[in-house]
């Protein structure tokens, strides 16, 4: 009888099924929806999380309109195809054979087409801008305190290496967090900025993906930081390919 058997859950992903049937009774966890093995010492990929979210029973699902994106992703939630490593497949299709290409965070980056649509590679999202507006406070937050607290959050809660938090901007009431991570910068074991941003987005909405942890309690020098609006912009290493018709609509 081991400690793993007493608490066989996944600390970093509550959307899992776990059982103590690994070596020496260790806890082995699989993502809902895909059944894929999950590493509970780090963040789960956004693709597997979306798949798990779509597989959850309708009455257990919290329907929240997704953020607006730089790529104007108004498609909402979808049930994605993930590769064996849990990343988004470059081409996604729905049940009616409508297909489109996505970037590494699963956001559509082309017009929709049919099954003949080709998506040659998964284009990496290398720059994410998280744009927040906080609720009114007695005064503005101190910029350096705010900067330090948000960097600490991404380092400790999401395990994102500090070098990938490029900047924190603040003009009351708007806070902007810039995450940057080129393909060449991302080493094995590094948390992906897309996954960190998704966990943060869900935390901000009060839908934490962490097992048994309380919701996100953001404080700057003891003062609660309450977010009332979130926009996330994704920039890809290769610009998206939309027709002019869409751009002028």
């Amino acid at each position: 009888h081991t400690a793993a058997q007493d608490n066989c859950t996944c600390p970093t992903n509550k959307m899992t099924v776990c059982s103590p049937d690994g070596p020496g009774g260790r806890c082995q966890c699989r993502a809902l929806g895909s059944g894929m093995a999950v590493d509970c010492s780090t963040l789960t990929s956004k693709c597997l999380l979306l798949k798990a979210r779509m597989s959850a029973p309708k009455n257990a699902r919290t329907l929240v309109r997704p953020s607006e994106h730089a790529l104007v992703d108004n498609d909402g939630l979808y049930d994605p195809d993930c590769d064996p490593e849990g990343r988004f497949k470059a081409r996604q299709c729905n049940q009616t054979s409508v297909c489109w290409c996505v970037n590494s965070v699963g956001v559509r980056r082309t017009d929709k087409g049919d099954l003949s649509l080709r998506c040659d590679e998964l284009v990496r999202t290398h720059h994410i801008l998280i744009d927040l507006r906080h609720r009114p406070t007695a005064g503005a937050f101190n910029h350096s305190d705010l900067d330090a607290e948000l960097r600490r959050l991404f380092r400790e809660r999401y395990r994102l290496h500090p070098k990938f938090v490029a900047a924190v901007h603040y003009e009351q009431p708007t806070i902007q967090i810039e995450l940057r991570q080129n393909t060449s910068q991302k080493a094995a074991g590094d948390v992906d900025i897309g996954d960190a941003a998704y966990y943060f987005e869900r935390d901000i909405k009060g839908e934490s993906l962490f097992q048994g942890r309380g919701g996100l309690d953001l404080r700057v020098r003891g003062e609660p930081l309450q977010v009332e609006r979130t926009l996330i912009y994704y920039l890809d290493e290769i610009p998206p390919k939309f027709s002019m018709k869409r751009l002028t609509a």
């Epitope: 793993a4 996944c10 260790r26 590493d39």
Partner: nanobody, 121 residues
């Protein structure tokens, strides 16, 4: 990139033996924990055996304990599974996997394509 290539599978009679090999490349094999997993037709993949990076610690699923032996040769970047006293219920696709073991959790992150083992008279 990580590559794992299994070999040694085949058709064997109940009570017989097979030795599976797994050639690894694309990562520092000598510092990686490894496992063998298997998947029988229509069943979920199950963990079979685990070995730590230097070969000093091994674990076996109850279903194969005493019959299977996992080993590795870090100088050849190769993982092995010696299977004795084979039974019909051992029939499955066997895959080697890179693994990670903590005090409480176990996970595999890369798998080979697999080699088929059929135990039948």
């Amino acid at each position: 990139q990580v590559q794992l290539q299994e070999s040694g599978g085949g058709l064997v009679q109940p009570g017989g033996s097979l030795r599976l090999s797994c050639a690894a490349s694309g990562f520092p094999f000598s510092s990686a924990d490894m496992s063998w997993v298997r998947q029988a037709p229509g069943k979920q993949r199950e963990w079979v055996s685990y070995i730590n990076a230097d070969g000093s610690k091994t674990y076996y699923a109850d279903t194969v304990k005493g019959r299977f032996t996992i080993s590795r040769d870090n100088s050849k970047n190769t993982l092995y599974l010696q299977m004795n006293s084979l039974r019909a219920e051992d029939t499955a696709v066997y895959r080697c996997a890179r693994a990670k073991l903590t005090d409480t959790h176990y996970v595999e992150d890369y798998w080979g394509q697999g080699t088929m083992v059929t135990v039948s008279s």
